[in-house]
Interface confidence: low
């Protein structure tokens, strides 16, 4: 019975549990490039780490298929509303999947907020957006974070804006 | 090969999986002491529990090293803006680590919000802040929750403000 | 010693790890029925799945007892404030437990927000509410999501409003 498996399979289960994929990437000054691409992340310094997951150009890359809880938080802030950002234009924060099976990114988890309706034109305002949820990812698929209005993303020391995942 | 291990190690793996560390602590009337210290939590009553984690003076204390998904939600609320809390002064909600390696607390996950810019001076307003992310903790290290403007934290029955963790 | 167990128990531990309960349900046009009941969810199409958990009338149903990280996000939005929704009336988003042991639903995780205080009467506004936390559930217990002001929940393609859980 393939489900009962052998000693080797049990050992493998232990080994894989020991290295159950997980990652936490943190915001850095270079995270927001202003190029329309996904946010970029720190993978090693401070609180950032990769365990059983890869990283490439802003993307967490899976090395094994499975269900993953993926999450991201972005710290938003500004003084009044930046030019062209009316109070009825939302800030969109999302997690997106890239896969060889589709030519375009696939929306996974998305949030919209109207943060700068809170403040008068010259007032400083702050907001935070958190996303998290379980998705199935094949080996080699990539997940990225995008904030369309990336000029509003506030980075600092890696604790305000971050991106992570772990297998469930 | 230390990675293949023995029967005893496999049994240990099963035992530790069975008691994989997890906790969920809930807000109580005594959570906010107004002393400038971290928020305090209920550890046993109602929805609160500790499994493989300790508690001390507001802190979750690890008993084994590893990667933990730590999270906290705080319910914020007020009538207008409390004296001295201008709309451009954010409410800061954070998870912080205490370790023997550093004399001061280390920021792990932090969020800023400008919640009372939403309401006129005499209006009631509500906001909620959620934080969650994976961090590495050594055995004996502590994690606490702080809200600098703790007079704005609204407690009730343990469902609005809470703090938890589990090993990933 | 029951804790050390037998080969069969270790195999069973491996089998159960392989199918550790998890689910992610997504919002659909039929999620908000306007009946005062819980939100309803898509369980199969797109990003939605059930693994070791059941579904019934909006509820995730456990098949085995344990600690679960449960989560939900709802996308809120509107034009100004809907009639009867003053800026001091919060939007309440919560996760609730149904069990045969109690006649009424039990609050697990709850959040309150005052989102439409952000916008003038004719302005479009958006807000998002995320909840997540670890709770203990017995086999057969149910968890549902409620938003009392469900006319403000914005559904679209299953990425904006969702509901999930996994065993920790």
């Amino acid at each position: 019975d393939q489900d009962t498996g052998s000693w080797e399979q049990l050992v493998q289960a232990r080994r894989s549990h020991k290295a159950s994929p997980a990652a936490h990437l943190t915001g850095a000054n270079s995270s927001s490039m202003g190029t329309g691409g996904p946010l970029l992340w720190e993978t090693q310094l401070g609180l950032a780490f990769l365990r059983g997951l890869g990283y490439h150009d802003g993307a967490l890359v899976t090395t094994q298929a499975g269900y993953y809880y993926i999450y991201s938080k972005v710290q938003l802030g500004g003084v009044g509303c930046p030019q062209g950002l009316a109070t009825d234009l939302p800030v969109t924060h999302g997690l997106y999947k890239r896969t060889t099976r589709y030519p375009e990114e696939l929306e996974l988890l998305v949030s919209r907020r109207s943060p700068c309706g809170r403040a008068a034109s010259s007032r400083v305002w702050w907001d935070s957006s958190f996303l998290g949820g379980v998705v199935h990812l094949e080996a080699g698929e990539e997940v990225v974070v995008r904030v369309l209005e990336e000029q509003l993303v506030r980075l600092r020391d890696g604790t305000r804006s971050y991106f992570g995942a772990f297998m469930v | 090969d230390q990675d293949t291990g023995s029967w005893e190690q496999l049994v240990q793996a099963r035992r530790s999986h069975k008691a994989s560390p997890a906790a969920h602590l809930t807000g109580a009337n005594s959570s906010s002491m107004g002393t400038g210290g971290p928020l305090l939590w209920e550890t046993q009553l109602g929805l609160a529990f500790l499994r493989g984690l300790g508690y001390h003076d507001g802190a979750l204390v690890t008993t084994q090293a590893g990667y933990y998904y730590i999270y906290s939600k705080v319910q914020l609320g007020g009538v207008g803006c409390p004296q001295g809390l201008a709309t451009d002064l954010p409410v800061t909600h954070g998870l912080y680590k205490r370790t023997t390696r550093y004399p001061e607390e280390l920021e792990l996950l932090v969020s800023r919000r400008s919640p009372c810019g939403r309401a006129a001076s005499s209006r009631v307003w509500w906001d909620s802040s959620f934080l969650g992310g994976v961090v590495h903790l050594e055995a004996g290290e502590e994690v606490v929750v702080r809200v600098l403007e703790e007079q704005l934290v609204r407690l009730r029955d343990g469902t609005r403000s809470y703090f938890g963790a589990f090993m990933v | 010693d029951q804790d050390t167990g037998s080969w069969e128990q270790l195999v069973q531990a491996r089998r159960s790890h392989k199918a550790s309960p998890a689910a992610h349900l997504t919002g659909a046009n039929s999620s908000s029925m306007g009946t005062g009941g819980p939100l309803l969810w898509e369980t199969q199409l797109g990003l939605a799945f059930l693994r070791g958990l059941g579904y019934h009338d909006g509820a995730l149903v456990t098949t085995q007892a344990g600690y679960y990280y449960i989560y939900s996000k709802v996308q809120l939005g509107g034009v100004g404030c809907p009639q009867g929704l003053a800026t001091d009336l919060p939007v309440t988003h919560g996760l609730y437990k149904r069990t045969t042991r109690y006649p009424e639903e039990l609050e697990l995780l709850v959040s309150r927000r005052s989102p439409c205080g952000r916008a003038a009467s004719s302005r479009v506004w958006w807000d998002s509410s995320f909840l997540g936390g670890v709770v203990h559930l017995e086999a057969g217990e149910e968890v549902v999501v409620r938003v009392l002001e469900e006319q403000l929940v914005r559904l679209r393609d299953g990425t904006r409003s969702y509901f999930g859980a996994f065993m920790v």
Epitope: N29, Q44, L45, G46, R156, D157 | Q64, A65, T100, R101, Y102, P103, E104, H136, E138, A139 | -
Partner: antibody
Framework: QVQLVESGGGLVKPGGSLRLSCAAS????????MSWIRQAPGKGLEWVSY???????YYSESVKGRFTISRDNAKNSLYLQMNSLRAEDTAVYYC??????????WGQGTLVTVSS | DIQMTQSPSSLSASVGDRVTITCRAS??????LAWFQQKPGKAPKSLIY???SLQSGVPSKFSGSGSGTDFTLTISSLQPEDFATYFC?????????FGPGTKVDIK
């Protein structure tokens, strides 16, 4: 009193291997985080690797994949296995302990010379 | 990596002088900064941690200050045994990095 004594240094050819040891005494070794730091002749200090009480490990980019840090709490010893050595690895290697403050005590160092 | 710079790279001073050495981090490191003293042929010795906390057994003529990116080590009255090289080191993020050092010699 606190003592850290390094050993194992010497002359090695490029591509070769060495294993450094650090014997600790005068304190409860298992309670401390430990590091290796090196200093090339006439140059500044460079942190090499760190190992926590529970053997959680970090390396500098310059040695990652070539050096392995380990500890044996029962023997009060810290080790650095150095493989694929290069000329630029020539340095005095120090072990240092860390608890509340970083590197509060250092060993006297051991010289590693990589040359053909 | 966080780059640490020190100024001056060397200085000449007399016994009894007040000496100040500065250290700058390429990004904010809160107060996670240490200072070390090293004499020729010897291992470094810890003087200051957490930017301003005096290591046990270190005389109070040594003091540290600063937070964020700019830090200072001050020796209030230089003594013969203080002629050495001084290094700063950040331990806010991996990899831990040291400054290039400031050599204090006799004028």
């Amino acid at each position: 009193q606190v003592q850290l004594v390094e050993s194992g240094g010497g002359l090695v050819k490029p591509g070769g291997s060495l294993r450094l040891s650090c014997a600790a005494s005068g304190f409860t070794f298992s309670d401390y985080y430990m590091s290796w730091i090196r200093q090339a002749p006439g140059k500044g200090l460079e942190w090499v690797s760190y190992i926590s009480r529970s053997s959680f490990i970090y390396y500098s980019e310059s040695v990652k994949g070539r050096f392995t840090i380990s500890r044996d709490n029962a023997k009060n010893s810290l080790y650095l296995q150095m493989n694929s050595l290069r000329a630029e690895d020539t340095a005095v290697y120090y072990c240092a302990r860390w608890e509340l403050s970083p590197f509060d005590y250092w060993g006297q160092g051991t010289l590693v010379t990589v040359s053909s | 990596d966080i780059q640490m710079t020190q100024s001056p790279s060397s200085l000449s001073a007399s016994v009894g002088d007040r000496v100040t050495i500065t250290c700058r981090a390429s990004q904010g490191i809160s107060n996670y900064l240490a200072w070390f003293q090293q004499k020729p042929g010897k291992a470094p010795k810890s003087l200051i941690y957490a930017a301003s906390s005096l290591q046990s057994g270190v005389p109070s003529k040594f003091s540290g200050s600063g937070s964020g990116t700019d830090f200072t080590l001050t020796i209030s009255s230089l003594q013969p045994e203080d002629f050495a090289t001084y290094f700063c080191q950040q331990y806010n993020t991996y990899p831990f990095t040291f400054g290039p050092g400031t050599k204090v010699d006799i004028k």
